[in-house]
């Protein structure tokens, strides 16, 4: 397995919150005798080997911050201790894991390392790490909110925002689909009895329209945009492109979106069949996401 860092640099103003993210990909042994630990620690720049030195994050060691997975277990961490220090580590079933740091200060600036350790029964560890830098700024030069810059291997050669690596798209869309479908199914029995219109069914994925333009040499990634809902017909369009294996790179990560997909419009909120059709469209799209992404 390997660890990927989507961003190599995060620039944030003081007082802001930031979430640093890594992702595990590649073959992962899920045997009953294998345990995985995912954790975070600080390190120093200018080492021969990045992340070879380790230091605590806000006085918490890597063991305080770790997420522990047994063969088929969900992750858990010493949640309360971390939260008291304004930290929270999290992990999902798509290989993403992150650390959220609240109320940043200048002291939080530095090199952060995410680490995945595999341990087989009675054996030592196999470990892989990723590194990223956090710069906390104050004063007039500080951005109004956090800006993330892509890792060099994923930087676009053009001056514009770079496209997301395919695994990031899959990861974001898969988790969004899971949340959307489960949320929708949980609401669906009430839709027939309740006279008020059901809430709109939205799949939130990052949109490039909110990108922060930067004078820096490498511009922020398209992945750092805020969430934006997709209109109903765009589900099928995005799903079909994803299924065809085209790596999305423009506004909705869909190549030639203008030819195929309608411009951004408010999602359907109508009752009855409209809502059911939209649910069907979401389902078709999400099935294509799961199928396509499972091939990664």
């Amino acid at each position: 397995f390997k660890v990927a860092t989507l961003y190599s640099l995060y620039v944030c103003p003081e007082g802001q919150n930031v979430t640093l993210t890594c992702r595990v990909f590649g073959p992962v042994d899920k045997g009953h005798d294998v345990t995985f630990y995912k954790t975070w620690y600080r390190s120093s720049r200018g080492e021969v080997q990045t992340c070879s030195e380790r230091r605590p994050i806000r006085n918490l060691t890597f063991q305080d911050l770790h997420l522990h997975h047994g063969g088929h277990q969900a992750a858990n961490t010493s949640h309360d201790l971390a939260q008291r220090h304004g930290l929270e580590s999290a992990s999902d079933h798509h290989g993403n894991f992150s650390i959220t740091m609240r109320n940043l200060t200048l002291l939080d600036s530095g090199l952060y390392c995410c680490l995945v350790v595999e341990i087989r029964h009675h054996h030592s560890e196999h470990r892989v790490h990723g590194a990223m830098e956090l710069q906390v700024q104050t004063g007039k030069d500080a951005p109004s909110s956090c800006v993330a810059y892509p890792s060099s291997s994923q930087e676009s050669e053009s001056k514009g925002p770079s496209s997301c690596p395919f695994w990031v798209i899959c990861s974001l869309l898969s988790s969004s689909c899971t949340q959307t479908l489960f949320g929708t199914l949980a609401l669906s029995p009430q839709a027939h009895r309740n006279p008020s219109p059901p809430p709109p069914l939205l799949l939130h994925i990052p949109s490039a329209s909110s990108l922060v333009q930067s004078p820096e040499a490498h511009s922020p990634s398209i992945c750092s945009g805020v969430s934006a809902p997709l209109a109903s017909l765009e589900w099928l369009c995005l799903g079909s492109h994803l299924w065809l294996g085209k790596v999305p790179h423009d506004r909705y990560w869909v190549p030639q979106a203008a030819k195929c997909c309608p411009s951004h419009q408010p999602p359907m909120t109508s009752e009855g069949w409209g809502s059911r059709i939209q649910l069907l469209q979401i389902s078709v799209f999400c099935v294509s996401v799961f199928l396509r992404c499972s091939l990664l």
């Epitope: 042994d29 345990t35 630990y37 954790t39 620690y41 030195e53 380790r54 230091r55 605590p56 060691t61 890597f62 063991q63 305080d64 680490l115 350790v117 595999e118 341990i119 087989r120 009675h122 054996h123 030592s124 560890e125 196999h126 470990r127």
Partner: antibody
Framework: QVQLKQSGAELVRPGASVKLSCKAS????????INWVKQRPGQGLEWIAR????????YYNEKFKDKATLTVEKSSSAAYMQLSSLTSEDSAVYFC??????????????WGTGTTVTVSS | NIMMTQSPSSLAVSAGEKVTMSCKSS????????????LAWYQQKPGQSPKLLIY???TRESGVPDRFTGSGSGTDFTLTISSVQAEDLAVYYC????????FGGGTKLEIK
């Protein structure tokens, strides 16, 4: 630079106890395991136990479980090993050593200066 | 526990000569997930603490002269000193760190 400095030589009576110290400098003490290794005169190296200073959790070689007790003092970046019910078999040089593991085992990249313990009446 | 056996227990060579010493483990110290051998070599000079020379069976620690070379895989390992110097007088230990920690009995290198 990274260093582990150990306390001076000890001469102790049989049946007594002794507490050895290992003071770390040049790195984040809480984030690396400290191991203790025994070397009897003219003999090889034997791993006793290790401790993670950040949590104070210690892990022992079964053979030394009733002999050694490890503790740490984070404020002074010091690790300690107490040896109890001493016999002539415990006469040895004791080393502390840092290992670079996170959750498993690892090689020892830094060694302490060593403390000679002599048990004699 | 994995047992480590070193041979010979001692050897004497002249300065400039090549020397090899062996270390055998009772079971493989190769980790299948990363294909690394969890074996290190240490040098202990008279009256001093051990010093890390080699880890992962063949990776030289920074600052260690390139006349020291580690090789082998699985259960059989070798430490080679290509041209022995007077300052290499020491006991050399192998150490497995795949499953807990065990050391070999050591090989004492003497200079003729």
């Amino acid at each position: 630079q990274v260093q582990l400095k150990q306390s001076g030589a000890e001469l102790v009576r049989p049946g007594a106890s002794v507490k050895l110290s290992c003071k770390a400098s040049g790195y984040s003490f809480t984030d690396y395991y400290i191991n203790w290794v025994k070397q009897r005169p003219g003999q090889g190296l034997e791993w006793i136990a290790r401790i993670f200073p950040g949590s104070g959790n210690a892990y022992y070689n079964e053979k030394f479980k009733d002999k050694a007790t490890l503790t740490v003092e984070k404020s002074s970046s010091a690790a300690y090993m107490q040896l109890s019910s001493l016999t002539s078999e415990d006469s040895a040089v004791y080393f502390c050593a840092r290992d670079d593991s996170f959750y498993g085992y690892w090689y020892f990249d830094v060694w302490g200066t060593g403390t000679t313990v002599t048990v004699s009446s | 526990n994995i047992m480590m056996t070193q041979s010979p227990s001692s050897l004497a060579v002249s300065a400039g000569e090549k020397v090899t010493m062996s270390c055998k483990s009772s079971q493989s110290v190769l980790y299948s997930s990363n294909q690394k051998n969890y074996l290190a070599w240490y040098q202990q000079k008279p009256g001093q603490s051990p010093k890390l020379l080699i880890y992962w069976a063949s990776t030289r620690e920074s600052g260690v002269p390139d006349r020291f070379t580690g090789s082998g895989s699985g259960t059989d390992f070798t430490l080679t000193i290509s041209s022995v110097q007077a300052e290499d007088l020491a006991v050399y230990y192998c150490h497995q760190y795949l499953s807990s920690y065990t050391f070999g009995g050591g090989t004492k290198l003497e200079i003729k």
